[in-house]
C-alpha cells in the first residue's frame, strides 16, 4: 500500500496547478478545509480523462467556476458535482 | 488486502485470439475511481501498457495495437478481460493485470498480479 | 506518443555505490512519472511516485528527482537488496509510455 493512500494523516496535494481546467472536461471536484493534518484548503478536480489533480484553492477561475456549479446546483442537476469533505 | 491473478491459455498459435482473464479481490470496480490495466513484457525486456478499463467503463487502448486489442469487465464477478487477436511471435510475452485508483496523489498500477507467461509458437 | 528513453540499460555496482539511473521524457509530463522497481521473477511495484515522493515501505535511500526533461532514480548506497529492473513510466497523458529498463547487478 502506497503512502499516498493514507490521505487522512497529511495533506493529499504535494504540488497544485494553476492553469485553467474547462468545466466540459471535469467529471467531479471536491473542496477539503484544513484539518487532519493538512493546514490548507485543497481542491481535487477529477476530469473525464481519467486524471485527478490538484487545484490552486485561489485561482481566481477556480472561483468563478465554483461559484457557476453552485449556483447552477440550486436549479438544476451540476455538471460537475461538488463534494466538501469534512476534515474533522 | 488487494490481490490481482491473470489466467489464460500458456501456449497458442499464430493468427490464434489470446483470452486472458484478470480475477480480482480487495476492491470493487463499480467504484468510482477504479480502473484495471494491462501491461506486457517480453522476455528479458522493458514494459508495454496495452490498454485501461475503468468503473464507468470507460476504456483507453495503446494505438499501436489498438486494432487487436478488447479490454472489458464483469463488475460483478471482479474480472477484467483483455483480448488480443490474430496473435504472432512477437505477441510472446508475460502479460500482468494491475490496479489504478483515481485518489490523490494519483499513482496508476499501485498493485500488480503475478503476471502470466504465454507463449506464441506454431 | 510520449517517448521514454531510459539509460543506461544496464549498470553493475559494488555495495554502498550511489547509482543513478535516468530517462528523458520527449514532451513534457510534468511531475507524472513512476518509477518501478522489479526484482528477479516479480511483479514491478512503485517506489517513487509523481517523480519524487517515496513510496511507502521503501527505504530512504531511494530519491526522484526531475531536471527539465530528465527524470532521475537514485540510490544513494546500494544494498543487495536493490539488485532489481528499474521502469519508468509517464502517466501524463495516453498512452501511457514506460522506458526500456535499466537491470541493477551488484559486482
Known amino acids: 500500500i502506497l503512502e499516498a493512500h493514507y490521505t487522512n494523516l497529511k495533506c493529499r496535494c504535494s504540488g497544485v496547478i494553476s492553469t485553467v481546467v474547462g468545466l466540459n472536461i471535469i467529471d467531479r471536484i471536491q473542496v477539503t478545509p484544513p484539518g487532519n493534518g493538512c493546514p490548507k484548503t485543497e481542491v481535487v478536480i477529477w476530469t473525464k480523462m481519467k486524471k485527478v489533480i490538484c487545484v490552486n484553492p485561489r485561482a481566481k477561475w477556480l472561483q468563478r467556476l465554483l461559484r457557476h456549479v453552485q449556483s447552477k446546483s440550486l436549479s438544476s442537476t451540476p455538471q460537475a458535482p461538488v463534494s466538501k469533505r469534512r476534515a474533522a | 488486502q488487494v490481490t490481482l491473478k491473470e489466467s489464460g491459455p500458456g501456449i497458442l498459435q499464430p493468427s490464434q485470439t489470446l483470452s486472458l482473464t484478470c480475477s480480482f479481490s480487495?476492491?470493487?470496480?463499480?467504484?468510482?475511481?477504479?480502473?484495471v490495466g494491462w501491461i506486457r513484457q517480453p522476455s528479458g525486456k522493458g514494459l508495454e501498457w496495452l490498454a485501461n478499463i475503468w468503473w464507468d467503463d470507460d476504456k483507453y487502448y495503446n494505438p499501436s495495437l489498438i486494432n487487436r486489442l478488447t479490454i472489458s469487465k464483469n463488475t460483478s464477478n471482479n474480472q477484467a478481460f483483455l483480448k488480443i487477436t490474430n496473435v504472432d511471435a512477437p505477441d510472446t510475452a508475460t502479460y500482468y493485470c494491475?490496479?489504478?485508483?483515481?485518489?490523490?496523489?494519483?499513482?496508476?498500477?499501485?498493485?500488480w498480479g503475478q503476471g502470466i507467461m504465454v507463449t506464441v509458437s506454431s | 506518443d510520449i517517448q521514454m528513453t531510459q539509460s543506461p540499460s544496464s549498470l553493475s555496482a559494488s555495495l554502498g555505490d550511489r547509482i543513478t539511473i535516468t530517462c528523458q521524457a520527449s514532451q513534457d509530463i510534468g511531475i507524472d512519472l513512476i518509477w518501478f522497481q522489479q526484482k528477479p521473477g516479480k511483479s514491478p511495484w512503485p517506489v517513487i511516485y509523481y517523480t519524487a515522493n517515496l513510496a511507502s515501505g521503501v527505504p530512504s535511500r531511494f530519491s526522484g528527482s526531475r531536471s527539465g526533461s530528465h527524470y532521475s532514480l537514485t540510490i544513494s548506497s546500494l544494498e543487495s537488496e536493490d539488485m532489481a529492473d528499474y521502469h519508468c513510466l509517464q502517466y501524463k497523458q495516453y498512452p501511457f509510455t514506460f522506458g526500456s529498463g535499466t537491470k541493477l547487478e551488484i559486482k
Open positions: 480487495g476492491f470493487s470496480l463499480s467504484t468510482y475511481g477504479m480502473g
Open positions: 494491475a490496479r489504478s485508483e483515481l485518489v490523490m496523489p494519483y499513482v496508476p498500477f499501485d498493485f
